[in-house]
Interface confidence: medium
């Protein structure tokens, strides 16, 4: 079972000093959201046994492997379902401690009842404070069943579950009509899931015999022993003050357990601690009594004398749970309770035992779970003890279970049960990841999830350039870094692949899939420079640049330009996809900017030195457009037009430029230059009699400027064909040339 | 679906006896509180009766008190009223009923059946 | 033994007004043990509030419960033909409950 403990400190005068704290044995507990260990979680459960909102309860990590909940503000608040989960991945478990109201009308003689399948459970609920109503009982806060105020026995309402199975596990309640419910008694029914004694799918396997206690879990077999109990079979008691299934913890404060209830997995529910005993574990146990909630009865023999922790201490030359066995039977000595070992592996297991007459390597025997009887390869006989070594064949996962050591003399005989588990070495079900790359570098992520049991001890990443045939290159990591694999070939593709292995002999693993990891491209060295650059209109600049001469060939894929608009923050990046080329034309630039300008040599995604920075100016852009544009026919040759000069110009005008059309015509269109920028007014001359023509313009300064609207007008009739439009402006007497 | 059923009514003389039926499905029987109440022509709803789910605990109204006897057989699923020394100001329909959502109230009741009582 | 008064016996009401009737207990009922039923001719009583102010599974939203201690209130905000029936209200939560006379809305 997952190595889980819920704690309650039930010292319940004030509220505020409450606490639950949830306790992880397990390795690797609660580290958090790597791959190797979820996080505990402790929380109230408000599905069922729902309280007034308070002010948040407030959670506190203390290392890996604890979390306690405080923060709580007044006794209502209390009342209810906690939980605790921890463990990772299949062995997620989940551990409930139900609170009752210390002034709660009803409350429960025993808040946990674990019983078997098909057994009768009896729950209950003594009255504390009395009401003349109804009491209603619910199963995980839905109605089951009534009872009328007279039916109590001896001031205790009894509900009787015949015949319970597992879906009857849960929380009940006992309330009387119209009272709070934070008044209700409050149980949590545990139903194992095979019949007393039974563990497994079909319950067909024999629990070990869990002493002092211990609960045999119904799916796995193993005893979940109450706090202050250890071992397989739960047959040695920790120190005072300790608990854990290692004994590793310590009770906090200095009355040690007192006062505090003690929650583990399923099947067993809570308990006070060992030693104690009563609703709020405050209570020493009586005389002759031991272990938690003080249920167990020492009955020493032999002048055996009972202490209320672990039970009887025996006098010397005896032993034995109450005393009974004496020390000339022989005995087996500080056999592990439980062992770990990998699968395929072929461990020595070795058994000490003690005795008068003194055992021999023949009389000690190894019996696996499957009944087959292992005989010693060899004995250590020392004056205190025989110690005989078993060599074990190639373990299997079905050598997984209750083993057995057996010392038989003419004196009498012991066994003693040890847990043995057979561990797969951890396969990884995904390959590495890859978090970045250089062109001789990469930095992977070895945490993957795997197949197989953990803890992970080491990560060894197996890597080597593709479709090579040479020795894969091995580094070895700690579990929880990411790797870096150095001094590779650049643009070089490497299959990676992740070991994990687990502690113990035989613990690496299979190597888990490969990925194909690419390195960078090497980086540019060349520094290109700028040779020049001119202005082929307002937005257009034509740039050129050369390089170094190097021996070999050229690396780079491409050249990137960069334009970089100072005064906007703004930066305009041309891709130059040869790496030939020298030149490039940048058109849609802003007229009138003043920009930086470099350019660098790329390949792949790096890119090489920019070179030394040019300084460009662009002209602006031309004027307004004229306003007013009209055309008016003169005769059947000459049509004159009249405009306005531009608003807001930024300079003087040059020119103005005409552009002359046909109506309709598919020909290219004429532009005719008028050079008296002053005037407001020319007459188009040479056009052909009875035809329509469409007319705009624009004005110059530096650069040219936005055409005007555009006007039509139809020359007069009955003319000659001309030879072609020619202007004439206003304050002009001869016309002229086309 | 949960249903209640009842059947058992018809006509008796005064002081005659009849025996009522409830018969209950849909739900787990044994576990619940059962009710009867009735109703007479044109009047409104009275409660009868009421037993425990084990059956060891029963209620009466005052005007059925040593006249009438509810029971139950949790393993046939079946609510009953005996009914004796009848008159008059027994003629109603009469319903079982049962609080089936823990509320209290009652949210399932039968269709009811008629006893008349008359000379 | 509480006794429930219902009022008025009678109520005349056209359809889409809004009905409002009154419960009122011989002495104190706790608010959790109040509940109005509907009984439309030749069937069952049918559950609407329960809590004096919870609706029952598949009640609509023009139903609606009030009140505290002795006055209780049944409210249908909207009257649609099919509520023209026999309204109790009953104090439940021990081994003997009572049942109020009951309120008939009629169509005016």
């Known amino acids: 079972a997952v190595d889980l403990t819920l704690l309650a400190n039930l010292r319940l005068t004030d509220p505020q000093r409450f606490f639950l704290t949830c306790v992880s044995g397990e390795a690797g507990a609660g580290r958090g959201s790597d791959a190797w260990g979820p996080p505990l979680l402790l929380e109230k459960d408000d599905r069922i046994v729902r309280t007034p909102p308070g002010p948040p309860l407030r959670l506190a990590r203390n290392g890996s492997h604890q979390v306690t909940l405080r923060g709580f503000s007044k006794p209502s608040d209390l009342v209810g379902v906690f939980s605790c989960v921890g463990g990772a991945g299949a062995r997620r478990t989940r551990v409930i401690y139900v609170h009752n109201s210390p002034g709660a009308h009803l409350l429960p003689d025993k808040v946990t009842h674990t019983v078997n399948k098909g057994d009768t459970a009896v729950l209950s609920a003594r009255v504390h404070k009395e009401k003349q109503t109804d009491v209603i009982w619910k199963s995980n806060g839905s109605y089951f069943y009534t009872l009328d105020w007279h039916e109590a026995q001896d001031g205790r309402f009894l509900l009787q579950l015949p015949n319970v199975q597992p879906p009857s596990s849960g929380i009940y309640s006992a309330t009387y009509l119209e009272a709070s419910p934070l008044g209700s008694a409050f149980f949590r029914l545990i139903v194992r899931g095979c019949g007393a004694g039974r563990w497994g799918p079909g319950c067909t396997k024999e629990c070990p015999g869990c002493l002092h206690g211990g609960v045999c879990h119904d799916h796995d077999g193993e005893c979940v022993c109450p706090p202050g109990f250890t071992g397989t079979r739960c047959e040695q008691a920790c120190r005072e003050g300790r608990f854990g299934q290692s004994c590793q913890e310590q009770c906090p404060g200095i009355s040690g357990c007192r006062g505090l209830t003690f929650c583990l997995p399923d099947p067993y529910g809570c308990s006070c601690g060992s030693g104690w005993r009563g609703s709020q574990c405050q209570e020493a146990c009586a005389p002759g009594h031991f272990g938690a909630d003080c249920r167990l009865q020492c009955q020493c023999q032999n002048g055996g004398t009972c202490d209320r922790f672990s039970g009887c201490v025996c006098p010397s030359g005896w032993h034995g749970v109450h005393c009974e066995k004496s020390d000339r039977i022989p005995q087996i000595l500080n056999m592990a309770s439980e062992l770990e070992f990998n699968l395929e592996t072929m461990p020595r297991i070795n058994c000490a035992a003690a005795g008068n007459p003194f055992p021999v390597r023949g009389s000690i025997e190894l019996r696996k779970p499957d009944g087959t009887v292992l005989l010693s390869t060899k004995a250590i006989v020392e004056p205190e003890k025989t110690t005989a070594e078993f060599e074990v064949p190639r373990l299997v996962l079905a050598d997984s279970g209750f083993w057995e050591c057996r010392v038989s003399t003419s004196g009498g005989q012991d066994s003693r049960r040890f847990k043995v588990n057979v561990k797969v070495p951890p396969v990884p079900l995904a390959a590495p990841r890859l978090l970045t790359k250089q062109s001789r570098q990469l930095v992977v992520s070895p945490l993957v999830s795997f197949s197989g049991d953990g803890p992970i001890s080491t990560v060894r990443l197996h890597y080597r350039p593709q479709d090579s045939t040479m020795d894969w290159s091995t580094i070895v990591v700690d579990p929880s870094e990411n790797v870096t694999l150095m001094n590779l070939r650049p643009k070089t593709g490497y299959s990676v692949r992740v070991q994990l292995s687990r502690p113990g002999e035989g613990g690496e693993g299979a190597w888990g899939p490969p990925t194909l990891m690419t390195t960078d491209c090497p980086e540019p060295l060349l520094q290109p420079w700028l040779e020049g650059w001119h202005v082929e209109g307002t937005d257009r600049l034509r740039v050129s640049w050369s390089l170094p001469l190097v021996p070999g060939p050229l690396v780079g894929d491409g050249f990137l330009l960069r334009l970089w608009d100072g005064t906007r923050g703004q930066e305009r990046r041309e891709n130059v996809s040869s790496p030939q080329a020298r030149t490039a034309l940048l058109t849609g630039l802003t007229p009138g900017t003043h920009y930086q300008l470099d350019v660098q040599l790329y390949h792949c995604t790096l890119l090489g030195p920019a070179s030394p920075p040019a300084h460009v100016l662009l002209p602006p852009s031309g004027p307004p457009a004229p306003r007013h544009l009209h055309a008016q026919a003169l005769s059947d040759s000459e049509i004159q037009l009249t405009w306005k000069h531009p608003e807001a110009l930024p300079g003087p005008i040059s020119k103005y430029v005409v552009e002359v059309q046909v109506a309709g015509g598919a020909g290219d269109p004429l532009w005719i230059d008028v050079d008296r920028p002053e005037e407001t007014s020319t007459i188009i001359r040479g056009l052909n009699a009875s035809t329509r023509y469409l007319f705009r313009m624009r004005a110059s300064i530096q650069g040219l400027g936005d055409w005007s609207n555009t006007v039509e007008e139809s020359t007069l009739g009955n003319g000659l064909q001309a030879e072609g439009p020619v202007q004439e402006s206003r304050a002009a007497e001869e016309g002229l040339d086309q | 679906e949960v249903q209640l059923l009842e059947s058992g009514g018809g006509l008796v003389q005064p002081g005659g006896s009849l025996r009522l039926s409830c018969a209950a499905s849909?739900?787990?029987?044994?576990?619940?509180k059962m009710w009867w109440v009735r109703q007479a022509p044109g009047k409104g709803l009275e409660w009868v009766s009421?037993?425990?789910?084990?059956?060891?605990?029963?209620y009466y109204a005052d005007s059925v008190k040593g006249r009438f006897t509810i029971s139950r057989d949790n393993s046939k699923n079946t609510l009953y009223l005996q009914m004796n020394s009848l008159r008059a100001e027994d003629t109603a329909v009469y319903y079982c009923?049962?609080?089936?959502?823990?509320?209290?109230?009652?949210?399932?009741w039968g269709q009811g059946t008629m006893v008349t009582v008359s000379s | 033994d509480i006794q429930m008064t219902q009022s008025p016996a009678t109520l005349s009401l056209s359809p889409g007004e809004r009905a409002t009737l009154s419960c009122r207990a011989s002495?104190?009922?706790?608010?959790?043990?109040l509940a109005w039923y509907q009984q439309k001719p030749g069937q069952a009583p049918r559950l609407l509030i329960y809590?004096?102010?919870n609706r029952a599974t598949g009640i609509p939203a023009r139903f609606s419960g009030s009140g505290s201690g002795t006055d209780f209130t049944l409210t249908i905000s909207g009257l649609e033909p099919e509520d023209f029936v026999v309204y109790y209200c009953?104090?439940?939560?021990?081994?003997?409950?009572?049942f109020g006379g009951g309120t008939k809305v009629e169509i005016k």
């Open positions: 009923a049962i609080s089936y959502s823990p509320v209290g109230a009652f949210d399932i």
């Open positions: 849909g739900f787990t029987f044994s576990q619940y």
């Open positions: 009953q104090k439940y939560g021990s081994s003997s409950l009572t």
């Open positions: 002495q104190s009922v706790s608010s959790s043990y």
């Open positions: 009421v037993i425990y789910p084990s059956g060891g605990v029963t």
């Open positions: 809590g004096a102010s």
